[in-house]
């Protein structure tokens, strides 16, 4: 017992931590003072009626990843204040409703990864009227969802069901929950997908399907009496799909009248772009989908891809597209021209070069585009990039950060409405007239700049942290500046006069520099009460670099005698 006790530490607020130890039981002597108890990653196998008896004020109990195989009936009887209970990844093979009955305040319950076959003989959750987040199921033994399983639950913020190996689904089992903001469904096979889909379509706002092999998925007409679908967003995560089954999935999505957002994360497309035109044209209507997000799409036969033109007509109403980290090196001109409503395009972490971008941003491409993100691609010339984008008349925001530009030419051409340009982490060592005068926001942080002397009359925000600047920029060149972030440079000092010359400045972040704590600098920074309002990272990030005996101390705390003043 004593070693058990020693593994637990509690602070004055009753937050007790005892995770990742060698506890084999719940420590004795726990009292009403305990508000939160984390005993995850231990070797607890048994919870008795008396273990938590005095913890009447306990609000959070985390017992994940122990070896719990037995919980006595009344173990949680005094936990009326408990809001968060995590019993995931233990060895509970039978769930008892008596455990949960007293937990009238519970908002979060995680039962994932326990080896139960079903959710018990009676309705487990019917007394949990405040429950918001529920996670149930496991990867292998949870094979059956029954109609009574979710009885009594009317509203859930999030419901996660690991039904990886589901073999039986009793119709209407999930229909009893009137509203679920986010349903996460892990299913290896798709055999029961349509049955579940029918039940959740009118109660779930955001549906997420995980780890499913849809290679052989075939859509058959739904036997749903209602087409009143609540689903606004459908996410496919780690799902396998083929050309043919993608078409079948699109037929399924057709049933969701109010679908606004479609997301594919970490999915694999085993195909070559062979989408059958005749069927597609006849059946597929993209409905109201406005946002399409694709992240880390894996296409094993990527270079065999051929004609995607059958899908072009489906894209005309889409307003936001993200295709991130999916080895995209070219967006066909024709597709770009079809994306008539597109306002936001994020192609981060792909393989775009200027010459192929030219094909993508052809005449009449993306006519409504306002924001283009090409972060971390293979762009190498600012001049070529700007010139390539001249066709995009409505473009105002461009993010080309994390491309290696190195140098910047003296002049460049850019779309005339440009307001925002992100050139952070592009290895540039100087800024020139290449930067458009129309900018309101410029981010050149994390580069090799030692000078900033550009006149940008409309600039409101300048992000220039993590460079090599030795002084603040000349305020007269930036008459409209509201925000200046210039932390982690080589600035040694700044004066009241310098700050005052930025007439419109509301926010300055200048911490992490090598401040010489001279008398002048200390008196200015310590006496100006208003300074703390402007310096958003004051005082924590303002440290003296010299004199040596105050190095590392916060500027606001340093006191120097007149005799040791370090004049700059």
């Amino acid at each position: 017992e004593s070693s058990n006790q020693a593994s637990l530490s509690c602070d004055r607020n009753g937050i007790c931590k005892g995770s990742s130890g060698s506890l084999n039981s719940i420590p004795s002597g726990l009292t009403e003072a305990v508000k939160s108890l984390d005993l995850s990653n231990n070797r607890i196998t048994y919870i008795s009626n008396s273990d938590l008896q005095r913890c009447v004020n306990l609000q959070a109990l985390v017992l994940t990843s122990n070896g719990i195989n037995t919980i006595e009936e009344d173990s949680f009887s005094s936990l009326g204040s408990l809001e968060h209970l995590d019993l995931s990844y233990n060895y509970l093979s039978n769930l008892s409703s008596s455990w949960f009955k007293p937990l009238s305040s519970l908002t979060f319950l995680n039962l994932l990864g326990n080896p139960y076959k079903t959710l018990g003989e009676t309705s487990l959750f019917s007394h949990l009227t405040k429950l918001q987040i529920l996670r149930v199921g496991n990867m292998d033994t949870f094979t059956k969802i029954q109609r009574k399983d979710f009885a009594g639950l009317t509203f859930l913020e999030e419901l996660e069901i690991d039904a990886s190996d589901l073999q039986s689904y009793e119709p209407k089992s999930l229909k009893s929950i009137q509203n679920v903001s986010h349903l996460i469904l892990h299913m290896k096979q798709h055999i029961l997908l349509l049955e579940i889909f029918v039940d959740v379509t009118s109660s779930v706002e955001c549906l997420e399907l995980r780890d499913t092999d849809l290679d052989t998925f075939h859509f058959s007409e739904l036997s749903t009496g209602e087409t009143n679908s609540l689903i606004k967003k459908f996410t496919f995560r780690n799902v396998k799909i083929t050309d043919e089954s993608l078409f079948q999935v699109m037929k399924l999505l057709n049933q969701i009248s109010g679908l606004l957002e479609l997301e594919f994360d970490d999915c694999t497309l085993n195909g070559v772009g062979n989408f059958r035109a005749s069927d597609n044209d006849r059946v597929i209507d993209p409905g109201k989908v406005e946002t399409l997000t694709i992240r880390r799409l894996h296409i094993p036969r990527f270079y065999l891809f051929y004609d995607l033109s059958t899908l072009y007509s489906l894209t005309e109403r889409v307003k936001r597209i993200t295709v991130e980290n999916s080895k995209v090196f070219l967006v066909p001109c024709l597709l770009s021209q079809h994306l008539k409503s597109l306002e936001y395009l994020d192609l981060s972490e792909n393989l775009m070069v200027e010459e192929y971008l030219k094909n993508s941003a052809c005449e009449d491409a993306w006519p409504s585009l306002q924001t283009l993100i090409l972060r971390q691609n293979h762009l190498a010339s600012l001049e070529k990039t700007g010139e390539t984008l001249l066709t995009l008349k409505n473009l105002t925001n461009i993010d080309i950060s994390k491309n290696s530009f190195h140098s910047m030419p003296e002049t460049c051409q850019w779309p005339e409405k440009m307001k925002y340009l992100n050139l952070s982490s592009t290895r540039i060592h100087s800024v020139t007239g290449c930067i458009p005068k129309t900018l309101e926001i410029l981010d050149v942080s994390n580069n090799n700049l030692n000078l900033f002397s550009l006149n940008l009359p409309q600039l409101k925000e300048l992000y220039i942290s993590r460079n090599k600047l030795m002084t603040l920029p000349d305020a007269s060149l930036l008459p409209m500046l509201l925000v200046l972030k210039i932390s982690r440079n080589a600035i040694t000092t700044f004066s009241k006069e310098q700050l005052d010359s930025f007439h419109t400045l509301k926010t300055l972040e200048a911490g992490g520099n090598n401040f010489i704590c001279s008398c002048e600098f200390l008196s200015f920074t310590q006496e100006q009460q208003a300074l703390a309002k402007v310096l958003i990272d004051w005082p924590a990030n303002y440290l003296c670099d010299s004199p040596s005996h105050v190095r590392g101390q916060q500027v606001q705390d340093v006191r120097l005698s007149v005799s040791e003043c370090h004049r700059t």
Partner: antibody, heavy 118, light 111 residues
Framework: QVQLQQSGPELVNPGASVKLSCKAS????????INWVKQGPGQGLEWIGW????????NFNENFKDKAALTVDTSSSTAYMELHSLTSEDSAVYFC???????????WGQGTTLTVSS | DIVLTQSPASLAVSLGQRATISCRAS??????????MQWYQQKPGQPPKLLIF???NVESGVPVRFSGSGSGTDFSLNIHPVEEDDIVMYFC?????????FGGGTKLEIK
């Protein structure tokens, strides 16, 4: 500046294996693919395959699927190619090259000469 | 596999004149309006050097006397005017389909 530095020449016995390295510098290693190309004595160029350091994904020429294994160590920005069951047919210069824009090889290593002989 | 046939295998040219090397693909290397065809130069004992990508885009730092043209299956590399430094080996390469393939090479010689 962008550089790919390959390991030195190798003389190995038939049936053995060899691991060639290619150390990258001057660019963000995980952002580009690394390709390997074979050039036999007085011969043309033969594409072996590529690896993307960001996710470790690979693609091979079928002719080399059982011959070559591609790996990366992102912490040292180094790509490796291991060649198995070597025969005299494998004697060649092996180049690593950076894949840009998904389609072209814009920077090449100096090459590693492999000689398989008993 | 896409087979790339370069012609001629060797080409004798006079310095200052134009040299044209052809590369024919066994099937189209077009990808949505872009020809995925590259040209490389290789000097003895050195790795290949990229000259042209996407059939006609000249790689940064490559002299303007090099140009590429063509689409579909027929491509050519032009060098004008030829300089002594150019009298080496040239290869075409396609990246439209896996496996990527190279042409057999064309050796430039002085006439």
């Amino acid at each position: 500046q962008v550089q790919l530095q390959q390991s030195g020449p190798e003389l190995v016995n038939p049936g053995a294996s060899v691991k060639l390295s290619c150390k990258a510098s001057g660019f963000t290693f995980t952002t580009y693919g690394i390709n390997w190309v074979k050039q036999g004595p007085g011969q043309g160029l033969e594409w072996i395959g590529w690896i993307y350091p960001r996710d470790g994904s690979t693609n091979f020429n079928e002719n080399f699927k059982d011959k070559a294994a591609l790996t990366v160590d992102t912490s040292s920005s180094t790509a490796y190619m291991e060649l198995h069951s070597l025969t005299s047919e494998d004697s060649a210069v092996y180049f690593c090259a950076r894949l840009t824009g998904g389609t072209f090889l814009d920077y090449w290593g100096q090459g590693t000469t492999l000689t398989v002989s008993s | 596999d896409i087979v790339l046939t370069q012609s001629p295998a060797s080409l004798a040219v006079s310095l200052g004149q134009r040299a044209t090397i052809s590369c024919r693909a066994s099937e189209s290397v077009e990808y949505y309006g872009t020809s995925l065809m590259q040209w490389y130069q290789q000097k003895p004992g050195q790795p290949p050097k990229l000259l042209i990508f996407g059939a006609s885009n000249v790689e940064s730092g490559v002299p303007v006397r090099f140009s590429g043209s063509g689409s579909g299956t027929d491509f050519s590399l032009n060098i004008h005017p030829v300089e002594e430094d150019d009298i080496v080996m040239y290869f075409c390469q396609q990246s439209r389909k896996l496996p990527w393939t190279f042409g057999g090479g064309t050796k430039l010689e002085i006439k």
